[in-house]
Interface confidence: medium
């Protein structure tokens, strides 16, 4: 059974390589009863969704950059 069928997680797997310029926004979902793991869901500029690895240094930088740009807006 996939993760999605075992818990109500939205990230079945994570996209490894993604360029920050392709990302429009990022949503970080904290663990909860619906899903035991932190999930990072990116909305891409083409409108599609992708799950990113929250442990990846690049993803951490992307999240930090997105959060900072939100604060400055």
């Amino acid at each position: 059974a996939s993760v999605a069928t075992e818990l109500r997680c939205q990230c079945l797997q994570t996209l490894q390589g993604i360029h920050p310029k392709n990302i429009q926004s990022v949503n970080v979902k904290s663990p909860g009863p619906h899903c035991a793991q932190t999930e990072v869901i990116a909305t891409l500029k083409n409108g599609r969704k992708a799950c990113l690895n929250p442990a990846s240094p690049i993803v951490k930088k992307i999240i930090e950059k997105m959060l900072n740009s939100d604060k400055s807006n």
Partner: antibody
Framework: EVQLLESGGGLVQPGGSLRLSCAAS????????MSWVRQAPGKGLEWVSA????????YYADSVKGRFTISRDNSKNTLYLQMNSLRAEDTAVYYC??????????????????WGQGTPVTVSS | DIQMTQSPSSLSASVGDRVTITCRAS??????LHWYQQKPGKAPKLLIY???NLESGVPSRFSGSGSGTDFTLTISSLQPEDFATYYC?????????FGQGTKLEIK
């Protein structure tokens, strides 16, 4: 054709029990989460419970926690809702719904995209 | 629990009108929101998933938008078969919750 068919509803006295069934066909039942949603007469939709594809994870609304049990038999393509200690406020039409929808290879969404016709439950003395 | 509030509760409109229904979440739910249509005596039907995606077979006059806490369902030109009750639903976290519904009636 993808189909869900509920059964088991009826009239029961307060404090009594009832077991609802939902027979699924037309899709790989074991791959998808399922939910029960109810609708009291003249009222809106209220989510009751959900279960993962394998049956390993279950979720309940506070209003039914400890009284209702959701389960599934993937070999029979059937979803169940065991309802105990029934109250007048449990009177409603009960729908089972499939939570479908793989959107992208790296992202999954849960939407109730297929519904049964509903089975009425009346709790009254 | 996440509360979903729809407005208006009821709405009278005419065939051909443009209609907008709003749904507000008590906390941010990203775009983890769906819209359903229900006709009397029938089961609900999925219209829009993930805030803005049209379910297969649903007419293009239906559209959804929003993210975070504020969402809208728009019907660009009402048809006779659109008179029904509409519900939003969040799946950001359990318990899953629905809005109280918006009843769309003929003026």
């Amino acid at each position: 054709e993808v189909q869900l068919l509920e059964s088991g509803g009826g009239l029961v006295q307060p404090g009594g029990s009832l077991r609802l069934s939902c027979a699924a066909s037309g899709f790989t039942f074991s791959e998808l989460s399922m939910s029960w949603v109810r609708q009291a007469p003249g009222k809106g939709l209220e989510w009751v419970s959900a279960i993962s594809g394998s049956g390993g994870s279950t979720y309940y609304a506070d209003s039914v926690k400890g009284r209702f049990t959701i389960s599934r038999d993937n070999s029979k393509n059937t979803l169940y809702l065991q309802m105990n200690s029934l109250r007048a406020e449990d009177t409603a039409v009960y729908y089972c719904a499939r939570e479908g929808g793989r959107l992208e290879p790296y992202y999954y969404y849960y939407a109730m995209d297929v519904w049964g016709q509903g089975t009425p439950v009346t709790v009254s003395s | 629990d996440i509360q979903m509030t729809q407005s208006p509760s009821s709405l009278s409109a005419s065939v051909g009108d443009r209609v907008t229904i709003t749904c507000r979440a008590s906390q941010s739910i990203s775009d983890n929101l769906h819209w359903y249509q229900q006709k009397p005596g029938k089961a609900p039907k999925l219209l829009i998933y993930d805030a803005s995606n049209l379910e297969s077979g649903v007419p293009s006059r239906f559209s959804g938008s929003g993210s975070g806490t504020d969402f809208t369902l728009t019907i660009s030109s009402l048809q006779p078969e659109d008179f029904a009750t509409y519900y939003c639903q969040q799946y950001y976290s359990t318990p899953l919750t629905f809005g109280q519904g918006t009843k769309l009636e003929i003026k």
